[in-house]
Interface confidence: low
């Protein structure tokens, strides 16, 4: 009938009872008319059920789009929403009708026996028990059993709504087997149908395989894989396994629930797959799937099956490792093998033990590599079952960036006499040896600190414009000698020397050494003075307990007031705008010393004597003199080094040796110590006397026995002695062969 109507905006259908809620008594007739602008339909409570035959919907006699709904003799169960709507639209008018039946205040469900409420135990979830009411303002409580518990609306999380039912936090009734609603009317109790409480869960938290990875076996061994599913409570789990050889004879699957701690919020299920004797066809991917119906989670692992136990080095195993001093070195033992091998590391044949500097395990780790770690490292892998062994040698080369020996003698400026020839030295130790050592220079006044420049202890010279020594214009005439190579303290060092032909100008000189792993530099302050001159008597470097005199000589006609000072222990402060070593300008850091004055025809000589020099006497000594005319102070600094007394030690070992009669034996015994020790040789504890066949050279360091005889066999001892004691090494020389008879016998 609505076909062809113009497309105008529709008004809501209009109900004959203009109320949202209508309350009527049971056994009366409900009649509502609905009018609109196009075809209408009605919806009413339970209109999917057989109760439809009581409900009558008729066309109105007085209008085109009008329908009347009639229910004679209404009952409590007719309570609910009555809706009149335009077909195929959302436009509707609704009235909620309460049929007040005090004998049946709750609207019965369709089944009329019992309902089911599904709940989860989540603390934050609420559940609605659908006990709708035929009366809007009932006092309803919820009864749960067993044990019996009653819940009443609290105006917060527990409530009852006649159109919706009873709302309550689900955890409050999760213990119960059943619940029902109860209303009290005039001291009479009325109950809704029973609702069975079903606590459900579906969530699987995780599925874990154990072992989880790296499973390796050899043919015939047993495989046991555990699959554990962790779920929320009240979940049932089905396990499903997928594996390579499904037709396995010896396969066994066991599923069980695991006990969890009381109060735990989760359940655990375990499925164990066992294959008693694996074959090569059992190699592959094993997948365990756990399903709760609403959710499935799975996990996989790869099982490798070897024909037999074996061990081999992996292709990535290094043969050469290069490192720089101070670095952390890691040499992993890369292997293929089953079962995992026992790993033992050796250095030059000696077993390595783990300590705080080295860890010898699957990875050989040297925490802070030093030169002495250079060498051949052997890793031996042993299969624990077959005892098969594999070995591999890794050469470790430790590089050392250039270190300049003299750099450690950090001292203020030594002063150099005007016009003298001087040699400056840089002794460089580096592995590999430096590929170049270059010298640079700069005038002292050009390198004075600008007020804006900060000076650090590590770089006290903020000089930037270094000039090559080839360009010595305006400076001292220089010659760089060819590098020398020397064995110093048992190390091969490169010595570079720079010769200053005549000390005319104060300058700074820098040597710079570079090798493949770094660079090192030393700045030498070359301060030229026309002032006093310091000499040491009797020696440049005294040993402790020896006596030494420092002589300061100055021209009497030019200088006066000669004074000896010693620099205090704290480093000289460098003030902005001054030269790197302003000793004369800063007498606060100096200690005045007692000294004796001598004079000859031209010079004053101030002698400061140190009797029984000790290590505490080391340091920088300053001689200060004043210009008679200008009163300007001149000072010269000399660093005094006192050598420590060191008991004799013998480096290296004498080796036992076997020699045939008539051959020669040559052995050396290198001793060190301060004062230098005397070396003596003994045979069978008796002093060895030189003769035509026994030759001692180089201060007895080298012993040669020419054309050895049977009587030369015995225990040879090299002994190095000084006032501080003795050191000795021994070796047994065995002489083989028959002694030839001589004509004299």
């Amino acid at each position: 009938a609505s076909v062809g109507l113009p497309s105008v905006s529709l008004d809501l259908p209009r109900l004959s009872i203009q109320k949202d809620i209508l309350t009527i008594k049971a056994n009366t007739t409900l009649q509502i008319t609905c009018r609109g602008q196009r075809d209408l339909d009605w919806l009413w409570p339970n209109n999917q059920s057989g109760s439809e035959q009581r409900v009558e919907v008729t066309e109105c006699s007085d209008g085109l789009f009008c329908k009347t709904l009639t229910i004679p003799k209404v009952i409590g169960n007719d309570t609910g929403a009555y809706k009149c709507f335009y077909r195929e639209t959302d436009l509707a008018s609704v009235i909620y009708v309460y049929v007040q039946d005090y004998r049946s205040p709750f609207i019965a469900s369709v089944s009329d026996q019992h309902g089911v409420v599904y709940i989860t135990e989540n603390k934050n979830k609420t559940v609605v028990i659908p006990c709708l009411g035929s009366i809007s303002n009932l006092n309803v409580s919820l009864c749960a059993r067993y044990p019996e518990k009653r819940f009443v609306p609290d105006g917060n999380r527990i409530s009852w709504d006649s159109k919706k039912g009873f709302t309550i936090p689900s955890y409050m009734i999760s213990y119960a087997g059943m619940v029902f609603c109860e209303a009290k009317i005039n001291d009479e109790s009325y109950q809704s149908i029973m609702y069975i409480v079903v606590v459900v869960g579906y969530r699987i938290y995780d599925v874990v395989l154990s072992p989880s990875h790296g499973i390796e076996l050899s043919v015939g061994e047993k495989l046991v894989l555990n699959c554990t599913a962790r779920t929320e409570l009240n979940v049932g789990i089905d396990f499903n396994w997928e594996y390579p050889s499904s037709k396995h004879q010896h396969k066994k699957l066991v599923n069980r629930d695991l006990k969890t701690q009381s109060g735990s919020e989760m359940k655990k299920f375990l499925s164990t797959l066992t294959i008693d004797g694996v074959t090569r066809s059992d190699q592959g991917l094993y997948t365990c799937a756990a399903s709760s119906g609403l959710m499935t989670k799975k996990n996989s692992t790869f099982v490798r099956v070897h024909e037999k136990p074996f061990v081999a080095f992996g292709s990535g195993m290094e043969s050469l490792v290069e490192a720089t001093v101070g670095e952390r070195v890691r040499i992993p033992a890369k292997y293929l093998g089953y079962p995992p091998p026992e790993i033992k590391w050796y250095k030059n044949g000696i077993p390595l033990e783990s300590n705080h500097t080295i860890k010898a395990g699957h990875v050989l780790t040297i925490m802070e590599v030093s030169e002495r770690d250079t060498g051949n490292y052997t890793v031996i892998l042993t299969n624990p079952i077959s005892k098969e062994k594999q070995s591999h040698v890794v050469s470790l080369v430790v590089y050392v960036p250039p270190q300049i020996g003299e750099k450690s003698l950090i001292s203020p400026v030594d002063s150099y006499q005007y016009g003298t020839t001087q040699t400056l030295t840089c002794t460089v130790y580096a592995i590999p040896p430096p590929h170049h050592i270059h010298w640079y220079w700069q005038l002292e006044e050009e390198c004075a600190n600008e007020p804006s420049q900060a000076v650090s202890v590590t770089n006290p010279y903020p000089c930037e414009e270094w000039r090559s020594v080839e360009d010595f214009q305006g400076g001292n005439k220089i010659e760089v000698n060819k590098n020398q190579f020397a064995l110093i303290e048992g190390k091969n060092k490169t010595v570079s020397t720079l010769v200053i032909q005549a000390a005319n100008v104060s300058a700074l000189y820098k040597c710079e050494a570079v090798n493949k792993v770094g660079r090192g530099e030393r700045v030498i302050s070359f301060h030229v003075t026309r002032g006093p001159e310091i000499t040491l008597q009797p020696d440049m470097q005294p040993t402790e307990q020896e006596s030494v005199s420092l002589w300061c000589t100055a021209d009497r006609s030019t200088f006066e007031n000669l004074t000896w000072y010693k620099l205090g222990p704290q480093p000289l402060p460098i003030h902005v705008g001054e030269l790197p070593t302003p000793v004369c300008k800063n007498l606060d850091t100096l200690w005045k010393l007692n000294a004796t004055m001598f004079s000859n025809s031209t010079n004053d000589i101030l002698i400061m004597e140190l009797k029984n020099a000790s290590l505490q006497d080391q340091g920088d000594y300053v001689c200060l003199a004043q210009d008679r005319k200008t009163k300007k102070r001149h000072c010269v600094v000399r660093q005094l080094t006192v050598l420590e007394r060191v008991a004799p030690t013998i480096t290296g070992n004498l080796e036992n040796q076997t020699t045939s009669i008539g051959e020669s034996i040559e052995v050396s015994c290198t001793a060190s110590g301060n004062p230098p020790p005397q070396i003596m040789w003994f045979k069978d504890n008796e002093t060895l006397v030189e003769d035509s066949g026994i030759v001692l050279k180089d201060g007895n360091r080298n012993l040669t026995i020419r054309r050895v005889r049977k009587e030369d066999e015995g225990l040879y001892t090299c002994q190095a002695c000084s006032v501080l004691g003795c050191a000795k090494v021994e070796a047994f020389f065995i002489i083989e062969g028959a002694q030839e008879k001589t004509n004299l016998e």
Partner: antibody, heavy 123, light 111 residues
């Protein structure tokens, strides 16, 4: 040649302690482990413990735990074995023995032995 | 009580072959640890005879040989000689005790 020289015979009272020394020569002392083994009169060999002369680490047989102490002095290439709370059943010959180094996985084999020190415990 | 056992004595005529057994368990010989053999003459220190199951140190005649299988090992002496009369001890390492273990010892008599 490689030699292990032990200290002289000792007679001790029950409850006392004994310290036996073993001086090594002819090889690099810190490169080889040292074992102590004892043999009671008419009985078999009994392993007591091992010391690493390089680091000084030790491992003792459970039977002697708490009573035995093994130490070394690298400056004299000497190892020491001290046994305390002596009882008559500790009467035995005490040997020091160097561990061989030919086979990396051959644990605890002894290629050079000292002549032994006789310790007699008697009241 | 030793965890590694040997027969108390074996004997043989000169020129004969004798074997000494050495029985351990899964924590020593059976765990793969090597077996070593020592010879001890009366009143002297033991001397290494075989190391690493079957290796002879220099100076030991090839009449002596060692073998190992499972949890036991054996020492064979072929062409028995008068100077072979001595006590023989096997030795291994026990991982459960974490210590070296000697066998009970076997006296070899040359008839």
């Amino acid at each position: 040649q490689v030699q292990l020289v032990e200290s002289g015979a000792e007679v001790k009272k029950p409850g006392a302690s004994v310290k036996v020394s073993c001086k090594a020569s002819g090889y690099t002392f810190t490169s080889y482990y040292m074992h102590w083994v004892r043999q009671a009169p008419g009985q078999g060999l009994e392993w007591m413990g091992i010391i690493n002369p390089s680091g000084g680490s030790t491992s003792y047989a459970q039977k002697f735990q708490g009573r035995v102490t093994m130490t070394r002095d690298t400056s004299t290439s000497t190892v020491y074995m001290e046994l305390s709370s002596l009882r008559s059943e500790d009467t035995a010959v005490y040997y020091c023995a160097r561990e061989g180094a030919n086979a990396p996985n051959s644990y605890y084999y002894m290629d050079v032995w000292g002549k032994g020190t006789t310790v007699t415990v008697s009241s | 009580q030793s965890v590694v056992t040997q027969p108390p004595s074996v004997s043989g005529a000169p020129g004969q072959r004798v074997t000494i057994s050495c029985t351990g368990s899964s924590s020593n010989i059976g765990a793969g640890y090597d077996v070593h053999w020592y010879k001890q003459l009366p009143g002297t220190a033991p001397k290494l005879l075989i190391y690493g199951n079957n290796n002879r140190p220099s100076g030991v005649p090839d009449r002596f040989s060692g073998s190992k299988s499972g949890t036991s090992a054996s020492l064979a002496i072929t062409g028995l000689q008068a100077e072979d009369e001595a006590d023989y001890y096997c030795q291994s390492y026990d991982s459960s005790l974490s210590e070296g273990v000697f066998g009970t010892g076997t006296k070899v008599t040359v008839l």
